[in-house]
């Protein structure tokens, strides 16, 4: 008799999830000499142990502690780039500006980027059919708790000037409900972080407005200032050109507004 299976509202575990995590771990540790000591089989076992056989709406940060321990990594604390709703550009930027790091440039962020996973209570099976949706089902699901945990730790590690890329095309340029707004902002350490510098990425070609004056940016400034951290804001008017000019500052097209 086929066993009854909980139907969740979100997509199921990414196909070939175990193989993908293991392969990413091997690739990452080969590319990053400082992480060569990491045993990828142990990493996978710890990852699996965080959610397998557990109810996918009852995952805690503690469940991920063994994985966090194995994935401990030191990135230069003054070279951290956070992002909200503009992941691709942030990643393209750190690929060019190699001395800056997003969460997904770290081992744990790299392992999980763009993946979905969940298990089932009391069985060792991975659920490839469906996983809980943060809004429709529950917030304490394996994926959400993972990102909350690693995002908190990443923000806590930051120092000096912390940069954040924000999407100027969205109605809420700064969204209090995003991971940045709900987790990272509140876990920057005022005794270590002097300034949060926001880079507002413009979408329209002819958009010359100063989006640093947007009400949601003023809200972010207020939150940050109350935490005794200075706030700074920059407009990136032409993100395509911006990337090109970071790659090649001598390019003749880099004389004008970016």
């Amino acid at each position: 008799v086929p066993r009854w299976r909980q139907q969740w509202s979100g997509p199921g575990t990414t196909k070939r999830f175990p193989e993908t995590v293991l392969a990413r771990c091997v690739k990452y540790t080969e590319i990053h000499p400082e992480m060569r000591h990491v045993d990828c089989q142990s990493v996978w076992d710890a990852f699996k142990g965080a959610f397998i056989s557990k109810h996918p709406c009852n995952i805690t940060e503690e469940d991920y502690q063994p994985l966090m321990k194995l994935g401990t990594q030191t990135v230069p604390c003054n070279k951290i780039l956070l992002w909200s709703r503009i992941k691709d550009l942030a990643h393209q930027f750190t690929q060019v500006q190699r001395d800056m790091f997003t969460l997904e440039d770290t081992l744990l962020g790299y392992l999980a980027d763009d993946l979905t996973w969940c298990g089932e209570f009391n069985t060792s099976k991975i659920n490839y059919q469906s996983c809980p949706d943060w809004r429709k089902d529950c917030s304490n699901n394996p994926v959400s708790v993972f990102w909350k945990t690693v995002s908190r730790r990443f923000a806590e590690a930051a120092c000096d000037v912390v940069h954040v890329m924000l999407n100027g095309s969205r109605s809420k340029i700064f969204d209090k409900n995003s991971t940045f707004g709900s987790v990272e902002v509140h876990n920057l350490q005022p005794e270590k972080v002097q300034t949060l510098e926001a880079w507002v990425i413009h979408g329209g070609r002819e958009d010359s407005r100063d989006l640093c004056q947007d009400p949601t940016i003023k809200e972010l400034e207020s939150i940050i200032s109350k935490r005794n951290i200075q706030f700074s804001c920059k407009n990136i008017y032409r993100p395509d050109k911006f990337l090109q000019c970071v790659k090649n500052p001598e390019d003749s097209s880099c004389t004008s507004e970016i």
């Epitope: 000096d160 920059k234 880099c254 004008s256 970016i258």
Partner: nanobody, 126 residues
Framework: DVQLQESGGGLVQAGDSLRLSCEFS????????MGWFRQFPGKEREFVAA????????DYSDSVKGRFTISRDNVKQMMYLAMNSLKPEDTAVYFC???????????????????WGRGTQVTVSS
């Protein structure tokens, strides 16, 4: 933190030259325009010159055009203002500032800048 520190001010005779420097230390990425402003006693700061992020585009106020030259070195994290043919009316406190954007679109407006140095005094005697 990003610090802007001016140096090079002083007392000179009319017709002399002076070179101001602005160190913008603490920056991982030097991708923003910078500018020089000056302030006369009891007056608002006024725009003097600006340079885009890569150093390839500049802008000057009419009062200094042809006499002052702005430049920058992103590797050394320095910006400069070479001041020639100085006049007594150039006497002021000179401030360097970092702009909110990479280009010179808002370079003449104080609101276009969000980081400021503390200033260096330039006095030109007749």
């Amino acid at each position: 933190d990003v610090q802007l520190q001016e140096s090079g001010g002083g007392l000179v005779q009319a017709g002399d030259s002076l070179r101001l420097s602005c160190e913008f230390s603490g920056r991982t990425f030097s991708g923003f325009a910078m500018g020089w402003f000056r302030q006369f006693p009891g007056k608002e700061r006024e725009f003097v010159a600006a340079i885009n992020w890569s150093g390839s585009d500049t802008d000057y106020s009419d009062s200094v055009k042809g006499r002052f030259t702005i430049s920058r070195d992103n590797v050394k994290q320095m910006m400069y203002l070479a001041m020639n043919s100085l006049k007594p009316e150039d006497t002021a406190v000179y401030f360097c500032a970092e702009a909110r954007s990479a280009g010179l679109g808002s370079s003449r407006r104080i609101e276009g800048y969000d980081k400021w140095g503390r200033g260096t005094q330039v006095t030109v005697s007749s």
